[in-house]
């Protein structure tokens, strides 16, 4: 805590300007009026204050706003944002997307810090949902943002926001997250025609059920192997050889290179070898001719 000392004669700050960088910490404390600082926060960023000096400025704002800073101040914090703790940020009420962008810009190029995570959490909770503009902004700064959310948090994403999602934003999502996002994407894109729909829905298909894959197989979509390999194994297993052939189109030849990996490996084990042979790819491991297939899971459900 900086000692309370009187401001030396002639040193009282009339405005926030570069002359303040020559002030000692105690002089900043004594000579800079907190209300002046609050109204001229936009100037702080342009002045090369030391970290110690920034600590003093933060202290002055904390004294002026013990319940949390107003948004007019928050929007212009600039590098002073890096001095804030998650506890400080929890006191804020950030409603403007411009404020959010300004603070994310300060942290740009770095990993998501606890401060940024808290800021985003406060902002999204304040809005009540992850709307399209917010999602656009967050994924622009942090492409992995969407996949860092829990399925519960993702449930607040309205289908209209899905338009803001780019394929790379889903790269690190696991099946539980895609289970939540896929139905929203399905709803969001349902007015598009077949080929356009597939282009948009493709990245979300790791959350699709079997029947949707069957429907897509009737659409001449030519799914690539990378997408196929990300499908839920249990959604792929019930597909017939003919359906997989239709789903993949010319990419069906890629199954050979993936025959030892899930879901291809598990799917092969469920198919009749005769049916696999019709693909002419030399896939091995199917059910031999003459064997009876019992679906025990269905048997259980029916008993």
């Amino acid at each position: 805590e900086v000692e309370k000392t009187a401001c030396p004669s002639g040193k009282k700050a009339r405005e926030i300007d570069e002359s303040l960088i020559f002030y000692k910490k105690w002089e900043l404390e004594a000579c800079v009026d907190a209300a002046l600082l609050a109204t001229q926060m936009d100037r702080v960023n342009a002045i090369p204050f030391t970290y110690e000096q920034l600590d003093v400025l933060k202290h002055k704002l904390d004294e002026l706003y013990p319940q949390g800073y107003p948004e007019s101040v928050i929007q212009h914090l600039g590098y002073l944002f890096l001095k804030m703790s998650p506890e400080d940020i929890r006191k804020w009420n950030v409603t403007s997307l411009e404020t959010l962008k300004a603070l994310l810009e300060v942290n740009k190029g770095h990993e998501m810090s606890p401060q940024v995570a808290t800021l985003i959490d406060r902002f999204v909770k304040g809005r009540g949902q992850l709307d399209k503009d917010t999602l656009d902004t967050l994924t622009a700064f942090y492409p992995g943002y969407l996949c860092s959310l829990s399925p519960e948090e993702l449930s607040s994403v309205p289908p209209s926001s899905i338009w803001a999602v780019r394929p790379q934003d889903l790269d690190t999502c696991d099946p539980r997250q895609l289970d939540v996002l896929y139905p929203k994407a399905r709803l969001a894109f349902q007015n598009m025609n077949g080929s356009e729909y597939f282009v948009k829905i493709q990245s979300f298909l790791g959350g699709a059920p079997t029947e949707d894959l069957k429907a897509l197989s009737q659409q001449n979509v030519s799914m690539d192997l990378a997408t196929f390999m990300k499908l839920r194994t249990d959604a792929v297993l019930p597909l017939t050889v003919a359906e997989v052939q239709k789903l993949l189109g010319p990419h069906v030849e890629g199954l050979k290179a993936e025959e030892r990996h899930r879901p291809v490996r598990d799917w092969i084990l469920r198919q009749r070898q005769d049916d696999l042979d019709t693909l002419g790819l030399g896939l091995q491991g199917g059910i031999p001719n003459g064997y009876l297939v019992l679906d025990l899971s269905m048997q259980e459900a029916l008993s």
Epitope: P183, G207, K214
Partner: antibody, heavy 122, light 107 residues
Amino acid sequence: QVQLQESGPGLVKPSETLSLTCTVSGGSIQNYYWSWVRQPPGKGLEWIGYIFYSGSTNANPSLKSRVIISVDTSKNQFSLKLSSVTAADTAVYYCAREVGRIAVAGWFFDLWGRGTLVTVSS
Amino acid sequence: EIVMTQSPATLSVSPGERATLSCRASQSVNSNLAWYQQKPGQAPRLLIYGASTRATGIPARFSGSGSGTEFTLTISSLQSEDFAVYYCQQYNNWPLTFGQGTRLEIK
């Protein structure tokens, strides 16, 4: 062919929790999305929410705070719990299958259970 | 939420005649509209989806039209088994919502 059958108590006391189960027979619960829809006597239909076999759900905002939808894939069943019920929750409750193969997308219902009447009364 | 309004509440038509039922959405639902038929003591039955596509096994006398906010279900020549309550449902956005129903009765 696939059939749906609702089961559960026909009478629930006010402020208690309504619990219903839908059993899917003749097909796997894993292939589709499954919904609950209700219909108060002499009134229209109201969508309650859906579940995917992985447990992912979505509920009508008007009921969300009181609704829990869950799934038991080993039994090919999904369930509805509606808490703090009042007389306004008296209705026929239907389980329904969200349409599959006939359309690439579309949240409407091509298969319904017969429905079960639940009366909320002390 | 999107509010679906059906009219008329009750429609009286003679067998063999044409019946026209209307459904209006409070905002555009594109063509994401389904029609159902419900008879007393039974579950609803899907008739039409995509505003105009007949579901499997639905007779050709049932037809749907419209897009945006105005939709129509037409039954060209009423059979005795067609007298029931008809509901429209939008699936353009969550929550999924239904109209309050039109009761089609014998005149």
